[in-house]
Interface confidence: medium
């Protein structure tokens, strides 16, 4: 077993809905008995080695578990001794122990069960940022931006929604932000504006609420 080594973090923590890159290097002897290409898979601990599908694999013929399909990706090339794992749209039920297996047909060569990865998916604690450029002046259009700069680009793009008693508005969005264009009225002063961000890949929603401070230009009549 000394010829088989896997170097990776013992424990990785990620908040739900977000992404994490797990660096990993894998070493195995050059055994001539296995003439096929080297493929690798990450499997969840507790599954039967032969009867359960992996969570991520470099073998295009092998099925992966539906629960992790498209979210867990073996980024590295095991033939180049790279077993790096990328997880997007992390879900609470992804929490668990994982191990790497290297395969070279026709025989399964080795499962690195002595170097298991402990994955912890915690509640999403971060909240969106709402950015107001300058002051809100009654009767003048303004752009409010709700952003989640901490979201990862590779994840499922979040869904933004705005809630307010303010008047009708227009919103546009990018991958990690949404711009709300609206013209505040004097009566909007003191009302609340909420930006909700839903990470559908993990089924989690976070929000940020602000209180509008609407100013008047001198000469405007107070109602």
């Amino acid at each position: 077993d000394l010829e088989f080594q896997l170097v990776a973090p013992e424990s990785v923590t990620v908040e739900e809905g977000l992404c994490v890159h797990v660096p990993c290097s894998v070493f195995y002897p050059s055994i001539k008995l296995t003439l096929g290409p080297v493929t690798g898979s990450w499997l969840r601990k507790g599954v039967s080695l032969h009867e359960d599908s992996p969570v991520a694999t470099s073998d295009p013929r092998q099925l992966v578990q539906k629960a992790t399909q498209g979210r867990f990706q073996l980024l590295g090339d095991p033939q180049k001794h790279d077993c790096s794992l990328f997880i997007r749209d992390a879900q609470k039920n992804d929490t668990g122990m994982y191990f790497f297996r290297v395969v070279r047909e026709p025989f399964v060569r080795y499962s690195y069960k002595k170097s298991q990865l402990s994955l912890h998916v915690t509640s999403l604690s971060r909240t969106p940022d709402i950015i107001i450029p300058g002051t809100l002046e009654a009767g003048y259009p303004s752009n409010l931006t709700c952003s989640v700069p901490w979201a990862c680009e590779q994840g499922t793009p979040p869904t933004f929604s705005w809630m307010s008693t303010a008047l009708t508005s227009l919103s546009s969005r990018t991958t990690d932000s949404s711009v709300l264009t609206f013209t505040p009225q004097p009566q909007d002063h003191g009302t609340k504006l909420t930006c909700l961000v839903t990470f559908s890949g993990a089924g989690v929603t976070v929000e940020r609420t602000i209180q509008l401070n609407v100013t008047r230009k001198s000469g405007q009549m107070r109602e």
Epitope: K32, H50, E105, F107, Y110
Partner: antibody, heavy 118, light 107 residues
Framework: EVQLLESGGGLVQPGGSLRLSCAAS????????MSWVRQAPGKGLEWVSV????????YYADSVKGRFTISRDNSKNTLYLQMNSLRAEDTAVYYC???????????WGQGTLVTVSS | DIQMTQSPSSVSASVGDRVTITCRAS??????LAWYQQKPGKAPKLLIY???SLQSGVPSRFSGSGSGTDFTLTISSLQPEDFATYYC?????????FGGGTKVEIK
């Protein structure tokens, strides 16, 4: 319980053909590499051929290369060995064997005798 | 091809004896070696794999050691059911090869 049951052995003349079958049960057949290993009367063990779980990879001993073909039908949980151009030295008990990993054989069938004689 | 040479070819021993069988590979095979037991008219049975790992269900009186080219199978206290022929097998390179066998007989 893992079971491997060979069939298809018998007496055949030199130059003739024979097809051996191995019916597997008690495990997920498609997940395992399977081999044929033979044993001439009163002699030791000789590995003949192996096929990967998917059937995509096959390997043969030089003594049978070009004459024998290993195959499998995962839908029927069955392993095959097609033996052509048989020679007297192919006379042996033929075992099918399951490989858990690493090129070892953890379960074997009871064997089927192939006799090549005129 | 990797040649596997077993010695002795036969050994006479009594119940309770400690029996040692050696297997030598013609080139280094790391720990890619298995040991099998075969009784007359029966299929071989896997005892040891990866040179020293005991197959599930095999009595602990069987043990394996070695690495590289020299390997040993030891039966610490021979039992009546242990009288059989033992084979080593390398799983390092194609073609997979077996040793010639060692017959353990009753003294």
């Amino acid at each position: 319980e893992v079971q491997l049951l060979e069939s298809g052995g018998g007496l055949v003349q030199p130059g003739g053909s024979l097809r051996l079958s191995c019916a597997a049960s008690g495990f997920t057949f498609s997940s395992y590499a399977m081999s044929w290993v033979r044993q001439a009367p009163g002699k030791g063990l000789e590995w003949v051929s192996v096929i990967s779980g998917s059937g995509g990879s096959t390997y043969y001993a030089d003594s049978v290369k070009g004459r024998f073909t290993i195959s499998r039908d995962n839908s029927k949980n069955t392993l095959y060995l097609q033996m052509n151009s048989l020679r007297a030295e192919d006379t042996a008990v033929y075992y099918c064997a399951k490989s858990p990993s690493d090129g070892y054989f953890d379960y074997w069938g009871q064997g089927t005798l192939v006799t090549v004689s005129s | 091809d990797i040649q596997m040479t077993q010695s002795p070819s036969s050994v006479s021993a009594s119940v309770g004896d400690r029996v040692t069988i050696t297997c030598r590979a013609s080139q280094g095979i790391s720990s890619w070696l298995a040991w099998y037991q075969q009784k007359p008219g029966k299929a071989p049975k896997l005892l040891i794999y990866a040179a020293s790992s005991l197959q599930s269900g095999v009595p602990s009186r069987f043990s394996g050691s070695g690495s590289g080219t020299d390997f040993t199978l030891t039966i610490s206290s021979l039992q009546p059911e242990d009288f059989a022929t033992y084979y080593c097998q390398q799983a390092f390179d194609f073609p997979i090869t077996f040793g010639g066998g060692t017959k353990v007989e009753i003294k």
